[in-house]
């Protein structure tokens, strides 16, 4: 980047150009380059208390190049800016500042958020989730048969994780009560996949109750249609007491 730096080495009068090194067109013993060869940029480099003129093929980081008819000059970016395109447009801010449309800011505007990796004001990204996958087979202790009420679960994927200011993700797991099919379990039938059996539709007085998984965020939010009527619960208890047939289960 800082190719073809020129500085004189032999003692000579300030404005004499012969003997100038590298890209210098004119130079002085004390100030280094005073002007540059065509297409090169003139920049001042601080060395201790002294400022020395140098000629560069491109401007260093923290400076931008301007071409004038008589000279191509490197000019320092604004104090809060690390690299800039021109005097009005910063392309990378110094630590503690965030870039927004070419300017360095302490805080990002509303509707944008600060990205501490890129040090830019960026779009707020909200959570995005997929559609629900189908309900899993109805199981009770891993079994898909018997007279017991079990549970079934469904899941959905997070397509887009939210950024710091983005909306949180809704539940990605949901569980609800269901009725395991009314038949005796055959030997080795435990955990049979639901696609191999018909899922029993609930009786008139039995609604399925969906409960978001305890891991998920909005588990406390109750959906009205998922609430079970107290009378229906009592009715089922009575029905269950009347079933005196014992069911053999394989554990």
């Amino acid at each position: 980047q800082n190719a073809s730096r020129g500085r004189r080495q032999r003692r000579m009068h300030p404005n004499v150009s012969q003997g100038c090194q590298g890209g210098c067109a004119t130079c002085s013993d004390y100030n280094g380059c005073l002007s540059c060869k065509p297409r090169l940029f003139f920049a001042l480099e601080r060395i201790g208390m002294k400022q020395i003129g140098v000629c560069l093929s491109s401007c260093p980081s923290g400076y931008y190049g301007t071409r004038y008819p008589d000279i191509n000059k490197c000019t320092k970016c604004k104090a809060d800016c690390d690299t800039c395109f021109n005097k009005n447009f910063c392309t990378k801010c110094k630590s503690g500042f965030y870039l927004h449309l070419g300017k360095c800011l302490d805080n990002c505007p509303e509707g944008l958020e600060a990205n501490n990796h890129t040090m830019e004001c960026v779009s707020i990204v909200h959570c995005e989730v997929s559609e629900w996958n189908p309900w899993s087979p109805c199981t009770k202790k891993g079994k898909t048969c018997g007279f017991k009420r079990g549970t079934e679960t469904r899941v959905r994927e997070i397509i887009q994780h939210p950024s710091a200011k983005g909306n949180l993700c809704p539940p990605t797991n949901e569980t609800r009560k269901c009725t395991v099919q009314r038949k005796k379990c055959q030997k080795g039938e435990r955990g049979k996949k639901g696609r191999e059996r018909k899922r029993k539709k609930p009786n008139k007085g039995e609604s399925k109750e969906a409960i978001p998984d305890s891991k998920s965020l909005e588990s406390s939010k109750e959906i009205p249609e998922q609430r079970e009527n107290k009378q229906q619960q009592k009715k089922r208890k009575v029905q269950d007491k009347q079933k005196s047939v014992s069911v053999s289960t394989v554990h």
Partner: antibody, heavy 117, light 107 residues
Amino acid sequence: QIQLQESGPGLVKPSESLSLTCSVTGYSITSGYYWNWIRQFPGNGLEWMGYISYDGTNNYNPSLKDRISITRDTSKNQFFLKLNSVTAADTATYYCSVLLIQYFNIWGKGTTVTVSS
Amino acid sequence: DIQMTQSPSSLSASVGERVTITCRTSESVNNFLAWFHQKPGKSPKLLVYHAKTLADGVSSRFSGSGSGTQYSLKINSLQPEDFGNYYCQHFWSIPWTFGGGTKLEIK
């Protein structure tokens, strides 16, 4: 040099979706800042609709948030506007524009969309 | 949303005159304000950004000024090609709203 060109149907029926394409030449849509959609109503008022940024993230005008979607196809160097459930009030000239460091702001020529049955 | 109040909504001026259009914002836009010129049937063209920076290729007859909530666009020595509509737009908080426009006509 960089150029933007809008395209899409000039007539859309009420309650249907409006879909427009902005084709970009002379610059990659994965560079630059924000690739915008702006519309101008028959009375000349301008409305910023939203953008897709160089990294694919979006920002939309809250007044359109439930109906608008801006996506892109980086392989074709195009970005798209989809506006759902349109009404006669969405009749306008639609412009795509870009905010860049070098040029700061460049607009396409615009495409007129009429919403009518 | 930040409201943009542009004034006047229309004005008539003669070639060679100097005119000023103002844009007032409902809250500070921290100089993230641009001015556009639009001729009939054409797309808007950027004149000024960051409140006072002249866009590439724009005549020095145009100048932007202001800060906070008050901004203005001055046109020195009006030329025939300057007539048309002028709009301000802020690029601060989302959404980036436009002013209602100023129609500049030949007297």
